[in-house]
């Protein structure tokens, strides 16, 4: 039962994270939560950074600055994949949840 619950939590978190990405950066509250998660967990996007390419409000040459290894204003524009976190947040945060929840 514990494994079923854990999988459900992960699935729910994945859906919720992707949903929040759709609102980025229009919703300031959502943006700050996602930015905090990406910066703190050193991750980018749900599965990986290319998830940001699918967000209509984000140009394909851009990821949030919080994806950058060294976060500075504007570092996510014309980014180089070598300078951003490549791991997705669902897997990264999911691992933390599995250990701690």
């Amino acid at each position: 039962a514990g494994y079923v619950f854990r999988d459900k939590v992960m699935s729910e978190f994945n859906n919720n994270f992707r949903q929040q990405m759709e609102n980025y950066p229009k919703n300031n509250h959502t943006a700050s939560i996602l930015d905090r998660m990406q910066a703190d967990f050193k991750c980018c996007g749900a599965a990986n950074y290319t998830d940001w390419e699918k967000i209509p409000s984000m140009s394909k040459n851009r990821v949030p600055d919080s994806c950058c290894i060294n976060v500075t204003v504007g570092c996510g524009i014309n980014f180089n994949e070598k300078a951003i976190h490549k791991e997705g947040c669902v897997e990264k945060i999911g691992g933390w949840l599995r250990k701690n929840v």
């Epitope: 040459n61 851009r62 204003v73 504007g74 180089n80 994949e81 070598k82």
Partner: antibody, heavy 118, light 111 residues
Framework: EVKLVESGGGLVQPGGSLKLSCATS????????MSWVRQTPEKRLEWVAY????????YYSDTVKGQFTISRDNAKNTLYLQMSRLKSEDTAMYYC????????????WGQGTLVTIS | DIVLTQSPASLAVSLGQRATISCRAS??????????MNWYQQKPGQPPKVLIY???KLESGVPARFSGSGSGTDFTLNIHPVEEEDAATYYC?????????FGGGTKLEIK
């Protein structure tokens, strides 16, 4: 000294294919995103495509999407542009260029290779 | 796509005078405190060469007589004092989003 040398251009019939190459030297090729830009006979510049440093991500202008394929071989320090189903509108001088991170300027360009569709 | 409109299409300036070229974007190219506008010079038979990036930063090795200004949608390239070797075509280009686009060019003639 940074050098970019394009090759592979020529005269092709409409509907034909061509593969352009851009041999580079003088910098760590695998560290940079690379672009193809073309210049029409009327001298208009048009960004065509760019590719990420690893080659894992590619981006195209709507005018060439599904028709052109950008790729790279980091072991050979070479950039490629595979062009298919060529049309007269694709007649242009094709340049490869190095894109700089963050500001997106194109700092180094090759001398270009001419593609004529006729 | 962001459309860049350059004006004038051509201009003739006397040696030692000021040349001013404008570039207007159909949408703001400024974000995060930066303006993603670049300027290039192209001489016949040569590829374009970057002069100015991020609207006002001078590319290494480019003479200080070249300067760029502007933000949002309106940008300017100034050349002062103009020298013989500045006869060329000048292009603006934005790198704010994909696709990158270029202006139609301004041909500078030295009188």
């Amino acid at each position: 000294e940074v050098k970019l040398v394009e090759s592979g251009g020529g005269l092709v019939q409409p509907g034909g294919s061509l593969k352009l190459s851009c041999a580079t030297s003088g910098f760590t090729f695998s560290d940079y995103y690379m672009s193809w830009v073309r210049q029409t006979p009327e001298k208009r510049l048009e960004w065509v495509a760019y590719i990420s440093s690893s080659g894992g991500s590619t981006y195209y202008s709507d005018t060439v999407k599904g028709q052109f394929t950008i790729s790279r071989d980091n072991a050979k320090n070479t950039l490629y542009l595979q062009m298919s189903r060529l049309k007269s509108e694709d007649t242009a001088m094709y340049y490869c260029a190095r894109r700089e991170d963050y500001d997106g300027r194109l700092t180094y360009w090759g001398q270009g290779t001419l593609v004529t569709i006729s | 796509d962001i459309v860049l409109t350059q004006s004038p299409a051509s201009l003739a300036v006397s040696l030692g005078q000021r040349a001013t070229i404008s570039c207007r974007a159909s949408k703001s190219v400024s974000t995060s405190g930066y303006s993603y506008m670049n300027w290039y010079q192209q001489k016949p038979g040569q590829p374009p060469k970057v002069l100015i990036y991020l609207a006002s930063k001078l590319e290494s090795g480019v003479p200080a007589r070249f300067s760029g200004s502007g933000s949002g949608t309106d940008f300017t390239l100034n050349i002062h004092p103009v020298e013989e070797e500045d006869a060329a075509t000048y292009y603006c280009q934005h790198s704010r989003e994909l696709p990158y686009t270029f202006g139609g060019g301004t041909k500078l003639e030295i009188k």
